[in-house]
Amino acid sequence: IIDGYKCKEGSHPWQVALLKGNQLHCGGVLVDKYWVLTAAHCKMGQYQVQLGSDKIGDQSAQKIKATKSFRHPGYSTKTHVNDIMLVRLDEPVKMSSKVEAVQLPEHCEPPGTSCTVSGWGTTTSPDVTFPSDLMCSDVKLISSRECKKVYKDLLGKTMLCAGIPDSKTNTCNGDSGGPLVCNDTLQGLVSWGTYPCGQPNDPGVYTQVCKYKRWVMETMKTHR
């Protein structure tokens, strides 16, 4: 997260880190005791999932292996539409005040809605500085019409943009797959943005979760 702030401890109990060994690979969101939602471009053969801590690499955090993941069948490595994936944990999470599932959206929030994005991605760009603490940024949803002015044909129908006019605050590498939460519901998953990160008026681009609720529910049901 560029130009963000340290998240209030315990305020994001659904936030998970997908680790490759001990290294951060992507963010993710707990949606059920067995399931984590993340970006399809974060796919690996297997994952170490850290839950229940704002500190990356926290020894006291829950760590659960995951060996199965299900990319959206419409994910395209060319256009990166449908950049969404479910990761099935090998064992169920122990729910607590520090570990909770996020609320999936009932509707799509409109442009102008205030949201918070979080992650352990680099806080500087192009040179990298990976924080140990979970970082947050407050952003507002931007209409597709406005966002298309910047990203033109790169912006797919189920991509969502968020940012603050003239501000550098944004996501960056390492934040991918992490949550954009608006009015206590998951509205976006970090997907992409311009590099170097933090260029004012280049919004962050997210997968619009409200358009995938049926797929999420059906996939979890099918692979129970």
Partner: antibody, heavy 127, light 107 residues
């Protein structure tokens, strides 16, 4: 001024492996993409694969999938390309090239222009 | 994967001539195309990126145009140092793919 300096020429036997290095002198490539391109004698350019070290993205052309491994050591600003199960058709000049990504995340491979190239490494495969 | 078809494969021209090289992608690649120049025994050199942006230090006689599937490299007035082989490459997404090359020879 950043330069990419590649390791020296190699002569290899069929079936063996070769590992070519590419070091960035006068700069770093941690936030760049490093691509590997080869050119057989009298032939055109062939893209083999690329890595973006800070994004952890490595991607390979289908033709080389399973035979090529591209890695990067950020501490020494050195990229490596290892090609295994060598055959005579792998005789070529191998180039590394550096370019800055335009995007992070899902779109990180899009539109990279490789503006700095190594001098090339001749790999000869012969029994 | 996206295929790139470059034409002509060779062209004979004189100093001062206008030379046009075309590149066609098998599917739309927006403006994500670059052009490189290569001289014998040397590494390729970037001329044009994002279909029409001139790389710093490259003479303005080189220009690029096109979008989608059809792209053109134009040398407005061929100079002696321009005799070389030119390649297009699609940079829409990995895996990148080069065209077959166009050799610009002295007539």
């Amino acid at each position: 001024q950043v330069q990419l300096v590649q390791s020296g020429a190699e002569v290899k036997k069929p079936g063996s492996s070769v590992k070519v290095s590419c070091k960035a002198s006068g700069g770093t490539f941690n936030n760049y993409a490093i691509s590997w391109v080869r050119q057989a004698p009298g032939q055109g350019l062939e893209w083999m694969g690329a890595i973006i070290p800070i994004f952890g993205v490595a991607n390979y052309a289908q033709k080389f999938q399973g035979r090529v491994t591209i890695t990067a050591d950020e501490s020494t600003s050195t990229a490596y390309m290892e090609l295994s199960s060598l055959r005579s058709e792998d005789t070529a000049v191998y180039y590394c090239a550096r370019g800055a990504p335009n995007y992070y995340g899902a779109q990180s491979s899009r539109g990279i222009a490789f503006d700095i190239w190594g001098q090339g490494t001749m790999v000869t495969v012969s029994s | 994967d996206i295929q790139m078809t470059q034409s002509p494969s060779s062209v004979s021209a004189s100093v001062g001539d206008r030379v046009t090289i075309t590149c066609r992608a098998s599917q739309g690649i927006s403006s994500w195309l670059a052009w490189y120049q290569q001289k014998p025994g040397k590494a390729p050199k970037l001329l044009i990126y994002a279909a029409s942006s001139l790389q710093s230090g490259v003479p303005s006689r080189f220009s690029g145009s096109g979008s989608g599937t059809d792209f053109t490299l134009t040398i407005s007035s061929l100079q002696p140092e321009d005799f070389a082989t030119y390649y297009c490459v699609q940079a829409n997404a990995f895996p990148y793919k080069f065209g077959g090359g166009t050799k610009v020879e002295i007539k």
